[in-house]
């Protein structure tokens, strides 16, 4: 048995007479032989579930579900109840109604075995019948909605009449009907005004019925019509077996360059017309098992279940259904030497499905694991400026298909033929398994005899000891020129273009910093800034060379504080900034401030220097001119 609603509403007035019928609660059957029996909870509750008093006023007919006043609620009773409502005005009280057989302990009130009946209290007597508006004569203030389980025996789930109105205003005639399209499974009995289902409902055919209830009021000569929505929701049960969309029960996959743990190798989709079990229970009750194979397969693969709600069309309306994606996933990184083919089977079981038929499917995955060979081009040729600064990125080396690799470890090394000319270093990029070549020793770069640098590039997969080699010829170009005195270590320090371009900084391939002019569009990824090389910094990503020293590209790598208009990077740096962003790496601070605009209206007086203490700079103090002050505050 279950209630057709989880909550009911009615009005209560002071001194309403004993015997006044209030409303009917309705139970629907889960099985044809069930007979409902109703009982009331012992207490009345108020605001925030406050237990107010034992219920001495309202009774229920156990067999019909009729609630009625068995004694009048007088003013003193209401005052007593109000006094216990934690100081809140008593506007609403509620009772719990239980469906027997249930435990006699009055605990939580949860649908389907319990419903709450709310009474809106009016500290006046019942109004004169002639003063009641048609809406008040027809329907409760709160619109009801109904829940009916699919595949259950038909039954009565609502009674239209407002019983106190019918009882206290017998001269007013009220008629009801349901507006519904052809062939809908509901009827309203004209005599009893009871609404019932004609037959068992099927949620997979229709999940929601948006009916309209029409009430016609006859009071003397006047006739008025009131219409309200009358929504019915059909509740699901597990009555559909899982199926394969388009009959596809097999997926084939090749594992080659993507060999990283957690890589999705292949996916098969299962469709289930049901939306139960609910999400909290789903993974426990809708099981998937990788059928036993050899030990290697069991260790290497796992199956992940990813359920998702979807909508399907049925009889012209949309109903919810579930698609289950079963992903075959690598459970570990695979060695590049691994080479095998296998068939895997996965058993999917909708354990709540009761039939007819089986709730079990068998999924098939055909997987080929191919070995990976390491190949480098026969040779590389690069040039580097003699003015290049330490950590300047001058090129990349990459084994064949390295951009596509994941889970494949390749370490690059440089072997120099001339010991005193070992200028370059190489680091492996975690992103694309390439090797980034960078200037590691600027002293060697400036030696006249180091005009041509010869290296052997060695790429190694340490797990298998497989290697690839290539020649690297680096030509050193240009003349070394010492930079201006007072140039910062980091290009990022410079806030203006002239001071940026006259200096070099760590990571600069040309020995000069580069100015990136922003687009000036508010907080933007394209903010103005000074960089060692706009190819790599800032690009929203702190690469493996930039991580070597915070002075190279704090715009991408800073973990400290950013002052001013900005959006922080994930996990570090400046994702977007306002105006010009400059940084003081050793202070672990960056500042994003409006572009400096010289104000022609500013006279000598306002150029006098002012001291501002800025709390948001973490105790920094800054002496700046009035025009800067104006921009700072405007910003």
């Amino acid at each position: 048995l279950y209630f057709s609603r989880d909550a009911y509403w009615e009005k209560l007035y002071v001194d309403q007479p004993a015997g006044t019928p209030l409303l009917y609660v309705h139970a629907l059957r889960d099985a044809p032989e069930e007979v409902p029996s109703f009982r009331l909870g012992q207490h009345l509750y108020g605001t925030y579930r406050t237990r107010l008093h034992e219920n001495n006023w309202i009774c229920i007919q156990e067999d019909t579900g009729l609630l009625y006043l068995n004694r009048s609620l007088d003013r003193s009773s209401w005052e007593k109840l109000s006094g216990r409502n934690r100081g809140f005005p008593l506007l609403t009280v509620y009772l719990k109604v239980f469906l027997s057989p249930t435990s006699l302990r009055e605990g939580e009130c949860q649908w389907p075995g319990c419903a709450r009946v709310y009474f809106s209290f009016f500290n006046t007597s019942f109004p004169a019948c002639t003063s009641l508006k048609p809406r008040e004569l027809c329907f409760p203030e709160t619109r009801p909605s109904f829940r009916i389980r699919e595949n259950r025996p038909p039954g009565t789930f609502h009674q239209f009449r407002l019983l106190p109105v019918q009882f206290l205003c017998p001269n007013i005639s009220v008629a009801y009907r349901l507006l519904e399209g052809e062939g809908l499974p509901f009827r309203c009995a004209p005599d009893s005004l009871e609404v019932s289902t004609r037959w068992a409902l099927d949620r997979e055919q229709r999940e929601k019925y948006e009916l309209v209830a029409v009430c016609t009021v006859h009071a003397g000569a006047r006739e008025e019509v009131v219409m309200v929505p009358f929504p019915v929701t059909v509740y699901d049960e597990d009555d559909s077996a899982p199926t394969f969309p388009a009959g596809v029960d097999t997926a084939s996959a090749v594992v080659e360059f993507k060999r990283k743990e957690d890589t999705v190798v292949a996916t098969l989709r299962v469709f289930d017309a049901d939306v139960v079990p609910a999400s909290g229970e789903l993974v426990r009750r809708y099981t998937s098992t990788l059928l036993p194979g050899d030990t290697w397969t069991q260790q290497t693969f796992r199956v992940e279940h990813w359920p998702n709600e979807t909508s399907v069309q049925a009889n012209g309306s949309f109903v919810r259904a579930t698609v289950h994606d079963y992903r075959l996933v690598l459970n570990r990184n695979l060695s590049i030497s691994e080479n095998r083919t296998m068939q895997l089977a996965v058993l999917v079981n909708d354990s709540d499905f009761q039939g007819p038929g089986a709730g079990v499917l068998l999924l098939h995955f055909n997987v080929s694991v191919l070995p990976v060979s390491l190949h480098l081009p026969s040779s590389y040729s690069l040039s580097v400026s003699r003015r290049a600064r330490r950590f300047a990125q001058i090129g990349k080396v990459c084994v064949e298909n390295c951009q596509a690799f994941s889970g494949i470890n390749v370490q690059y090394e440089l072997h120099s033929s001339g010991a005193n000319c070992s200028t370059l270093g190489v680091v492996t990029s975690a992103e694309d398994t390439s090797g980034i070549l960078f200037v590691n020793d600027t002293k060697a770069l400036r030696r006249p005899k180091c005009a041509e640098l010869h290296y052997m590039v060695v790429a190694t997969n340490h797990q298998t000891s497989r290697q690839a080699q290539a020649q690297l010829l680096v030509t050193v170009e240009g003349l070394y020129v010492a930079e201006e005195a007072g140039c910062p270590l980091s290009c990022a320090v410079s806030k203006r273009r002239p001071e940026c371009e006259e200096c070099g900084g760590l990571g600069s391939p040309t020995g000069r910093c580069e100015w990136r002019q922003g687009d000036g569009k508010g907080i933007t990824r394209n903010f103005s800034t000074c960089s060692p090389s706009t190819k790599t910094c800032p690009d929203g990503h702190c690469d493996v060379v930039e991580t070597q020293d915070i002075n190279i590209c704090p715009q991408d790598c800073l973990r400290g504080s950013i002052v001013g208009g900005h959006e922080p990077g994930e996990p570090r740096g400046i994702k977007a900034g306002y105006g010009t962003c400059n940084c003081f790496p050793e202070e672990e601070k960056c500042f994003c401030e409006p572009e400096d605009i010289q104000d022609p209206l500013c006279d000598e007086l306002c150029r006098e220097q002012k001291l501002i203490s800025e709390e948001d700079l973490g105790g920094e103090q800054k002496l700046i001119s009035e025009e800067d002050l104006h921009h700072h505050h405007h910003h």
Partner: antibody
């Protein structure tokens, strides 16, 4: 030849303000490539960097977190000097205080130091 | 804050000895590292900056090495005027921090 000459009282009462000045000769307080620092030394804390001021288009100050709420370092371009103010002192602030020039852009090493001023905080 | 740990805290040596002092940083500081010498009643004096660059006017018997977290100061042949306390310092991130000092005494 750069020289730094320190001046200021050697005795300060608890809760009062410690004030020291460092006069610069042979360089400018507004120089673009250096920063002007205060450092103190005590048996309990060893050498402790307190803060700095430097000029690059604007004046900037940076302070150690341990004293940030109490410290002010001010440049004085007219007298080519810079000063330290440390508020609300306690006996813990008793130390030998040094001013020093720091090379701002090649790793901030301190190549010139003042002679030091022993400050005792006592009532 | 970056911690700087010097060892040993003191050592005894004779004139002409080769002396090595080490300093370890609590995190990678690349070469943002300096060595200072301090004699009683005097301010510290810069010996080595950027881990291995000799400050002008400092005798060539002093040399610095290391990068990352481990650094050394070597005095190739100890002279009478070298008996003093030596401090290391990092300038990678603020606050700049110093080691606790190594006192070199006459044996």
């Amino acid at each position: 030849q750069v020289q730094l000459q320190q001046s200021g009282p050697g005795l300060v009462k608890p809760s009062q303000t410690l004030s020291l000045t460092c006069a610069i000769s042979g360089d400018s307080v507004s120089s673009n490539s250096v920063a002007w620092n205060w450092i103190r030394q005590s048996p309990s804390r060893g050498l402790e960097w307190l803060g700095r001021t430097y000029y690059r288009s604007n004046w900037y100050n940076t302070y150690a977190v341990s004293v940030k709420s109490r410290i002010t370092i001010d440049p004085d371009t007219s007298k080519n000097q810079f000063s330290l103010q440390l508020n609300s002192v306690t006996p813990e602030d008793t130390a030998l205080y040094y001013c020093a020039r720091g090379h701002r852009y090649s790793g901030s090493y301190f190549d010139y130091w003042g002679q030091g001023t022993l400050v005792t905080v006592s009532s | 804050d970056i911690q700087m740990t010097q060892s040993p805290s003191s050592l005894s040596a004779s004139v002409g000895d080769r002396v090595t002092i080490t300093c370890r940083a609590s995190q990678n500081i690349n070469s943002y590292f300096n060595w200072y010498q301090q004699k009683p009643g005097k301010a510290p004096k810069l010996l080595i900056y950027a881990a291995s660059s000799l400050q002008s006017g400092v005798p060539s018997r002093f040399s610095g090495g290391g990068s990352g977290t481990d650094f050394t100061l070597t005095i190739s042949s100890l002279q009478p005027e070298d008996f003093a306390t030596y401090y290391c310092q990092q300038t990678y991130t603020i606050p700049w921090t110093f080691g606790q000092g190594t006192k070199v005494e006459i044996k």
